[in-house]
């Protein structure tokens, strides 16, 4: 499974969208977890509503919010008030009982606010942009190794 690299600005929000085959994963809750080390376990950060029908409702754990559009097959995770400590490798998962199937691996990189850094160069972020979205390549602060999110394998 390819890893998608997403960059966000410290202090702002980063939105991650993981797409999946809606019918294949019908009835399954989704989760966002943080990988501990290269081969280590993935520590659950937040998961969608316990009642699958209500998965569209936002569930929050600290500064991380998750919601699932089960018809469209898109689970959205928002990391609010991004901090340097949020950088790392994460997974979107589809849950079936005790089994967690990886939908997408996401490497989150946190950029320092250029206003706080004299060496930030000419990096320009529109004033109204308070949220970065994965696959939004028009901003130089967001890039994908894999531009499309393929259906889960």
């Amino acid at each position: 499974l390819n890893t998608t690299v997403l960059q966000g600005m410290a202090g702002q929000s980063l939105r991650v969208s993981c797409t999946y085959d809606a019918l294949k994963h019908w009835g399954r809750r989704k989760a966002w977890c943080r990988q501990l080390g290269e081969e280590g376990p993935c520590q659950r950060v937040v998961s969608t509503h316990g009642v699958w029908l209500l998965a569209f409702l936002k569930k929050r754990n600290g500064s991380t919010v998750i919601a699932d559009d089960t018809l469209a097959g898109t689970v959205t995770i928002t990391l609010k008030n991004l901090q340097a400590g949020d950088a790392g490798l994460y997974q979107c998962q589809s849950l079936r009982g005790r089994e967690a199937e990886v939908l997408q691996k996401v490497l989150v990189e946190v950029l320092e606010d250029p206003l706080d850094d004299q060496d930030a160069g000419d990096l320009w972020v529109p004033e109204e942009s308070s949220s970065f979205e994965g696959a939004q390549v028009e901003h130089s602060t967001s890039r994908n190794q894999e531009t499309s999110f393929p259906p889960t394998s």
């Epitope: 085959d21 019918l23 294949k24 019908w26 009835g27 699958w52 029908l53 079936r96 009982g97 005790r98 089994e99 259906p151 889960t152 394998s153």
Partner: antibody, heavy 122, light 107 residues
Framework: EVQLVQSGAEVKKPGESLKISCKGS????????IAWVRQMPGKGLEWMGI????????RYSPSFQGQVTISADKSISTAFLKWSSLKASDTAMYFC???????????????WGQGTTVTVSS | DIQMTQSPSSLSASVGDRVTITCRAS??????LGWYQQKPGNAPKRLIY???SLPSGVPSRFSGSGSGPEFTLTISSLQPEDFATYYC?????????FGQGTKVEIT
């Protein structure tokens, strides 16, 4: 009408190979998981494994892992169950069944094939 | 694997009787449980899904209840065509597992 139609009864000798089929119609075959279930003579139902024809993602029961191969060809809306070397203990009725999709989530096995009798005897 | 313990393994009843069959899961399976009826020589038929939901076409005398480890199938008034074998199936975790079956016979 949603249907799963299985291939006919088979009589085989130990050591022979066999592939039985399950053809779906009346619905989008690639979008529903298909399970295989064994029923030995006079016994209960045993879940063997399941496949998602859309991408051939397959899960097996540990009891059947390595004993059979589950596959699917979405272009002909058909799932398959294959043995490379049959044993007398494989004598049973085999059912395919579709995992249902309900508003509240998955609905178990909602549509079943009529079953394929496999007899393995020397 | 999750074990499904079904009881009783068989029972004798008369037409009009109320019949209850129980399935107990060895661990939590939420409401990911179905009930199936099988008559000799036929494929199983789904009676209940999501522990308590009745598919269209299934008579209302069949009902399911329970959550967590214990689930129940009830036939409120047994009819001649209900004499068959009944199975529960958990589809919460792989591998899915069936109960051992309950054969309902005529007294």
């Amino acid at each position: 009408e949603v249907q799963l139609v299985q291939s006919g009864a088979e009589v085989k000798k130990p050591g022979e190979s066999l592939k039985i089929s399950c053809k779906g119609s009346g619905y989008s075959f690639p979008s529903y998981w298909i399970a295989w279930v064994r029923q030995m003579p006079g016994k209960g139902l045993e879940w063997m494994g399941i496949i998602y024809p859309g991408d051939s993602d397959t899960r097996y029961s540990p009891s059947f892992q390595g004993q059979v191969t589950i596959s699917a060809d979405k272009s002909i809306s058909t799932a398959f169950l294959k043995w490379s070397s049959l044993k007398a203990s494989d004598t049973a009725m085999y059912f395919c069944a579709r995992q249902g999709i309900e508003v509240t989530g998955t609905g178990g096995l909602d549509v079943w094939g009529q079953g394929t009798t496999v007899t393995v005897s020397s | 694997d999750i074990q499904m313990t079904q009881s009783p393994s068989s029972l004798s009843a008369s037409v009009g009787d109320r019949v209850t069959i129980t399935c107990r899961a060895s661990q939590g399976i939420r409401n990911d449980l179905g009930w199936y009826q099988q008559k000799p020589g036929n494929a199983p038929k789904r009676l209940i899904y999501a522990a308590s939901s009745l598919p269209s076409g299934v008579p209302s005398r069949f009902s399911g209840s329970g959550s967590g480890p214990e689930f129940t199938l009830t036939i409120s008034s047994l009819q001649p065509e209900d004499f068959a074998t009944y199975y529960c199936l958990q589809h919460n975790s792989y591998p899915w597992t069936f109960g051992q079956g309950t054969k309902v016979e005529i007294t």
